[in-house]
Interface confidence: medium
């Protein structure tokens, strides 16, 4: 059963599935200037048996015959229904989630694919949210949404995620704006929101005690 609508929109956040339930479809979209080959599949489908799941069909893009390479690829009518898009890459994937029974891993890229993937999710699919670059999560807790069937209708649960962005106050001299990372988390592989080498915190103590307090500081 396909989910009727998109996962909820969270301000300054994007979502990604760690693994895809059997029945999920991924549109075969091509980047500008390319199109699907004539006999090519419209979509890839996650299928499987009790022990193994994989993507059926292959997406293939070829150079467009027309010279107008700025023309957007127009989706087929059946593709315009239930457009779920994701372009978020995340290093936070639980390693064992993608090997869940009845789930497919993220499909490998195909040549000249579009920058944004469009999925058609099924009931039971879980997606994970995280804040986009320059934003941070303000609360602990699971930032996930599940497509559920309730009273014959599908709905997505509401993820508990609030993203805040204060680039003016959190940007320090000599630092570049951060790249996308989980929940706006600083990453040393890219640039940092706050570098841990420069960032220091030090405790000082003042005691107002009726009893005595003896303190020593670790250096």
């Amino acid at each position: 059963e396909l989910c009727d609508d998109d996962p909820p929109e969270i301000p300054h956040a994007t979502f990604k599935a760690m693994a895809y339930k059997e029945g999920t479809m991924l549109n075969c979209e091509c980047k500008r200037g390319f199109r699907r080959i004539k006999s090519g599949s419209l979509y890839m489908l996650c299928t499987g048996n009790s022990s193994h799941s994989s993507w059926d069909n292959q997406c293939q893009c070829t150079s467009s015959a027309t010279r107008n390479t700025t023309k957007q690829v127009t989706p087929q009518p059946e593709e315009q229904k239930e457009r779920k898009t994701t372009e978020m890459q995340s290093p936070m994937q639980p390693v064992d989630q993608a090997s869940l029974p009845g789930h497919c891993r993220e499909p490998p890229p195909w040549e000249n694919e579009a920058t944004e993937r469009i999925y058609h999710f099924v009931v039971g699919q879980m997606v994970y949210y995280q804040c986009v670059q320059g934003y941070r999560a303000l609360h602990r807790g699971p930032a996930e949404s599940v497509c559920k069937m309730t009273h014959g209708k599908t709905r997505w649960t509401q993820p508990q995620l609030i993203c805040t962005g204060e680039m003016e106050t959190s940007q320090f001299p000599g630092e570049e704006k951060p790249q996308a990372s989980p929940e706006g988390r600083p990453e040393s592989e890219t640039s940092c929101l706050v570098t841990t080498t420069d960032f220091q915190i030090q405790t000082e103590m003042a005691a107002t005690m009726e009893t005595s307090i003896f303190t020593t500081e670790y250096q």
């Epitope: 290093p91 936070m92 994937q93 639980p94 390693v95 989630q97 934003y135 941070r136 999560a137 303000l138 609360h139 602990r140 807790g141 699971p142 930032a143 996930e144 805040t164 962005g165 204060e166 106050t169 959190s170 320090f172 989980p182 929940e183 706006g184 988390r185 600083p186 929101l193 706050v194 570098t195 841990t196 420069d198 960032f199 220091q200 915190i201």
Partner: antibody
Framework: PSGTLSLTCAVS?????????WSWVRQPPGKGLEWIGE???????NYNPSLKSRVTISVDKSKNQFSLKLSSVTAADTAVYYC???????????WGQGTTVTVSS | DVWMTQSPSSLSASVGDRVTITCRAS??????LNWYQQKPGKAPKLLIY???SLQSGVPSRFSGSGSGTDFTLTISSLQPEDFATYYC?????????FGQGTKVEIK
């Protein structure tokens, strides 16, 4: 003992008004780590329920520091107290050097 | 509160050994699990966040895995500087809670 413990954490190398929570964690001698509470620069706080009635955490943005007050201390509050930057779902990545507090009667 | 249980509480190993420490949560915490290393007289140091992501500057011999309730920290080849106490911490809910620690000693 019925005194109040006051600790201040000075933040350098960045603004305390950045999008971070700031936590206090303590460690009794020879024991594990216990989270005390945290504060956001707006003044929003979260406290450990086990200590909530005795804990106050505040922030002073002008001095780029945040503070812990623990009231009605006893010997059980003897510990090394750490302050840390808390990335919420992604752990505490920057820590203060720690201050040893000994409460004796 | 979510309770974290580490095992073993201590272990003896030699340089070059492969060391595995486990952490179990009292309820599912998805992948919101972090690992810290602490040496005597020093503050904890973040090693792994989100169950399996290596904190910047941490050697690649450290790795983390798991999801749900069961998690593992692995040191592929123990080095002299790795003898320390290791803590897991859940950040799924407030208050964040730590495991009781695993002390890695020289055999």
């Amino acid at each position: 003992p019925s005194g109040t413990l006051s600790l201040t954490c000075a933040v350098s190398g960045g603004s305390i008004s950045s999008s971070n929570w700031w936590s206090w964690v303590r460690q009794p001698p020879g024991k594990g780590l216990e989270w005390i509470g945290e504060i956001y620069h707006s003044g929003s706080t979260n406290y450990n329920p086990s200590l909530k009635s005795r804990v106050t955490i505040s922030v002073d943005k002008s001095k780029n520091q945040f503070s812990l007050k623990l009231s009605s201390v006893t010997a059980a509050d003897t510990a090394v107290y750490y302050c840390a930057r808390d990335l919420m779902n992604y752990g505490m990545d920057v820590w203060g050097q720690g201050t040893t507090v000994t409460v004796s009667s | 509160d979510v309770w974290m249980t580490q095992s073993p509480s201590s272990l003896s190993a030699s340089v070059g050994d492969r060391v595995t420490i486990t952490c179990r949560a009292s309820q599912s915490i998805s992948s919101y699990l972090n690992w810290y290393q602490q040496k005597p007289g020093k503050a904890p140091k973040l090693l792994i966040y989100a169950a399996s992501s290596l904190q910047s500057g941490v050697p690649s011999r450290f790795s983390g895995s798991g999801s749900g309730t069961d998690f593992t920290l692995t040191i592929s080849s123990l080095q002299p500087e790795d003898f320390a106490t290791y803590y897991c911490q859940q950040s799924y809910s407030t208050p964040p809670t730590f495991g009781q620690g695993t002390k890695v000693e020289i055999k």
